[in-house]
């Protein structure tokens, strides 16, 4: 029997300092480029090696970025989101949502970390 896959969603505030080559990551998403079904949010698609984000270590590929310097990223065109990051200044505050996949045991078996029972 297959285990069921659950997700643990957490939010975090990440403060990055723009490095010589910038913030060091790529994004996908936006109202004109939905990456997740029925969600026009902005997601991290790539963390560049030795960039500011990689050196900080907290931002992960697959994270959803909720806001930049307090500005909500909802309902933005893809390029408008890109421009927001590019114009965000030297010190950049990101509100991000991490989505951690949790593999539970097969039905009938209480896996580690399963609070039920």
């Amino acid at each position: 029997m297959n285990g069921r896959v659950d997700y643990l969603v957490t939010e975090e505030e990440i403060n990055l300092t723009r490095g010589p080559s910038g913030l060091g990551f790529n994004i996908v998403g936006g109202t004109d480029q939905q990456y997740v079904s029925n969600d026009s949010g902005i997601y991290v698609s790539r963390i560049k090696e030795n960039g500011a984000a990689a050196l900080d270590g907290r931002l992960q590929e697959g994270d959803k970025i909720l806001s930049v310097n307090g500005q909500d990223l909802k309902n933005l065109l893809h390029q408008d989101a890109v421009d927001l990051f590019r114009n965000a200044g030297y010190a950049v505050s990101l509100r991000v949502q991490h989505r951690l996949q949790v593999q539970n045991g097969p039905i009938g078996h209480r896996g580690e970390g399963d609070p039920s029972g």
Partner: nanobody, 127 residues
């Protein structure tokens, strides 16, 4: 991550044309910015052309401007490089490259570091 396979290379006479194709596997192709680079024997890798995820923006190296045209078909997961008025100095191995998503930093399509996925290359020889 997509995998990239180039095709369409070959031997052509000066003044002739070729169309290179780069086929991508995977369902995320439409999120990729795509580029073409080339490398001639004993020379450094050279930027040829690039195209944005939507196809709205295109970029060309100085040596191919006005002769080469990049395009993409997101329904077919393919990017094309139409090469016209070919010259012997266009002889090289041509590589397709992809960048997943848009950089939030200043974009330089000619910088190989922008790209995270590369094809194996296809030989173009102009005699």
């Amino acid at each position: 991550q997509v995998q990239l396979v180039e095709s369409g290379g070959g031997l052509v006479q000066a003044g002739g044309s070729l169309r290179l194709s780069c086929a991508a596997s995977g369902r995320t192709f439409r999120y990729y910015s795509m580029g073409w680079f080339r490398q001639a024997p004993g020379k450094e890798r050279e930027f040829v052309s690039a195209i944005s995820w939507s196809g709205d923006s295109t970029y060309y190296g100085d040596s191919v401007k006005g002769r080469f045209t990049i395009s993409r078909d997101n329904a077919k997961n393919t990017v094309y490089l139409q090469m016209d008025s070919l010259k012997p100095e266009d002889t090289a191995v041509y590589y397709c490259a992809g960048a997943f998503g848009s950089t939030v930093d200043n974009y330089d399509p000619s910088d190989p570091r922008e790209y995270d996925t590369w094809g194996q290359g296809t030989q173009v020889t102009v005699s």
